[in-house]
Interface confidence: low
């Protein structure tokens, strides 16, 4: 993925399809890479990222990564191709319109990651357990 200052000049709406034939066009995502964050012990947080970019590739989705260790908390916002692992993890929730954080096992830190495929969906990251994909209302939103 190219950096946001380059990406801002990209003006291309090429489209690809997913495995089900659903049409995909370049996503608009928050793209601040890694920034320090004050997001902690909250049901949801805003990214506080002021950079919106059109993703370089049509198949890319929005991703947010929240990490906490003994020293600091960071939030990473990027575009990424869901066919490829990110931080060694598969983007299993890439079809979701909302960025629902899921904890991943990483030694020495608390690590949450989410991905989603609606415009700027990684601006609002959701930790609350009430937003999981067993919620029929959320499934309705995803597949309508």
């Amino acid at each position: 993925t190219i950096p946001p200052h380059v990406q801002k000049s990209v003006n291309n709406d090429m489209i690809v399809t997913d495995n089900n034939g659903a049409v995909k066009f370049p996503q608009l995502c928050k793209f601040c890479d890694v920034r320090f964050s004050t997001c902690d012990n909250q049901k949801s947080c805003m990214s506080n990222c002021s950079i919106t970019s059109i993703c370089e590739k049509p198949q890319e989705v929005c991703v947010a990564v929240w990490r906490k260790n003994d020293e600091n908390i960071t939030l990473e916002t990027v575009c990424h191709d869901p066919k490829l692992p990110y931080h060694d993890f598969i983007l299993e929730d890439a079809a979701s319109p909302k960025c629902i954080m899921k904890e991943k096992k990483k030694p020495g830190e608390t690590f949450f990651m989410c991905s989603c495929s609606s415009d700027e969906c990684n601006d609002n990251i959701i930790f609350s357990e009430e937003y999981n994909t067993s919620n029929p209302d959320l499934l309705l939103v995803i597949f309508q």
């Epitope: 003006n11 291309n12 709406d13 489209i15 659903a22 049409v23 608009l28 919106t52 415009d119």
Partner: antibody, heavy 122, light 107 residues
């Protein structure tokens, strides 16, 4: 119910300026990219501009680039189009429209306002 | 820019007729095409997206097909409320250009 209501159109001289507004209701305005599309009298549709939900990203048709500015105020659920250095060929009905948020809609504009007429004439 | 050409530019038909409108792109756009209906003095309304998917609330007599450069909008049995102008639009590249429109009139 999704509603988009444009205002601000009118008669303006060539070289003049006008600011269009589009008041949105019935949906979460700040998560949708919004577009302006225009239609000259008796002619077809022409895409003008798009702005992302946060306002962080904008794109323009070549015909208006450098003269028009799209913006939004999410606290007021309002979309704007600032039109400067207006020309006779900018005369049209201007529609604001919501870009579908979901990828299977191909970025189609799924809801439109009723339009506001801009006439550029001396 | 990708050019979109619709044909015919106008047609006359009767209630109950089967109506077909075609749209041709100047280059391949895969299946990335939308159809809109516009009535006089009104805003356009999305009918079909992704060449063949019916927008919610649109009657099933409307259907779309095609891929690559050639696309078709079909109204299986024309109703009085269907007399309008129809536009195709490609979403393959910026700017998302429209066809010039096809006016469906009462015979």
């Amino acid at each position: 119910e999704v509603q988009l209501v444009e205002s601000g159109g009118g008669l303006v001289q060539p070289g003049g300026s006008l600011r269009l507004s589009c008041a949105a209701s019935g949906f979460d305005f700040d998560i949708y990219a919004m577009t302006w599309v225009r239609q000259a009298p008796g002619k077809g549709l022409e895409w003008v501009s798009v702005i992302s939900g946060s306002g962080g990203t904008t794109y323009y048709a070549d015909s208006v680039k450098g003269r028009f500015t799209i913006s939004r105020d999410n606290s007021k659920n309002t979309l704007y189009l600032q039109m400067n250095s207006l020309r006779a060929e900018d005369t049209a009905v201007y529609y604001c429209a919501r870009r579908s948020q979901y990828r299977d809609k191909v970025g189609a504009t799924d809801y439109w306002g009723q339009g506001t007429l801009v006439t550029v004439s001396s | 820019d990708i050019q979109m050409t619709q044909s015919p530019s106008s047609l006359s038909a009767s209630v109950g007729d089967r109506v077909t409108i075609t749209c041709r792109a100047s280059q391949s756009i895969s299946s990335y095409l939308n159809w809109y209906q516009q009535k006089p003095g009104k805003a356009p309304k999305l009918l079909i997206y992704a060449a063949s998917s019916l927008q919610s609330g649109v009657p099933s007599r409307f259907s779309g097909s095609g891929s690559g450069t050639d696309f078709t909008l079909t109204i299986s049995s024309l109703q009085p409320e269907d007399f309008a102008t129809y536009y195709c639009q490609q979403s393959y590249s910026t700017p998302p250009t429209f066809g010039q429109g096809t006016k469906v009139e009462i015979k």
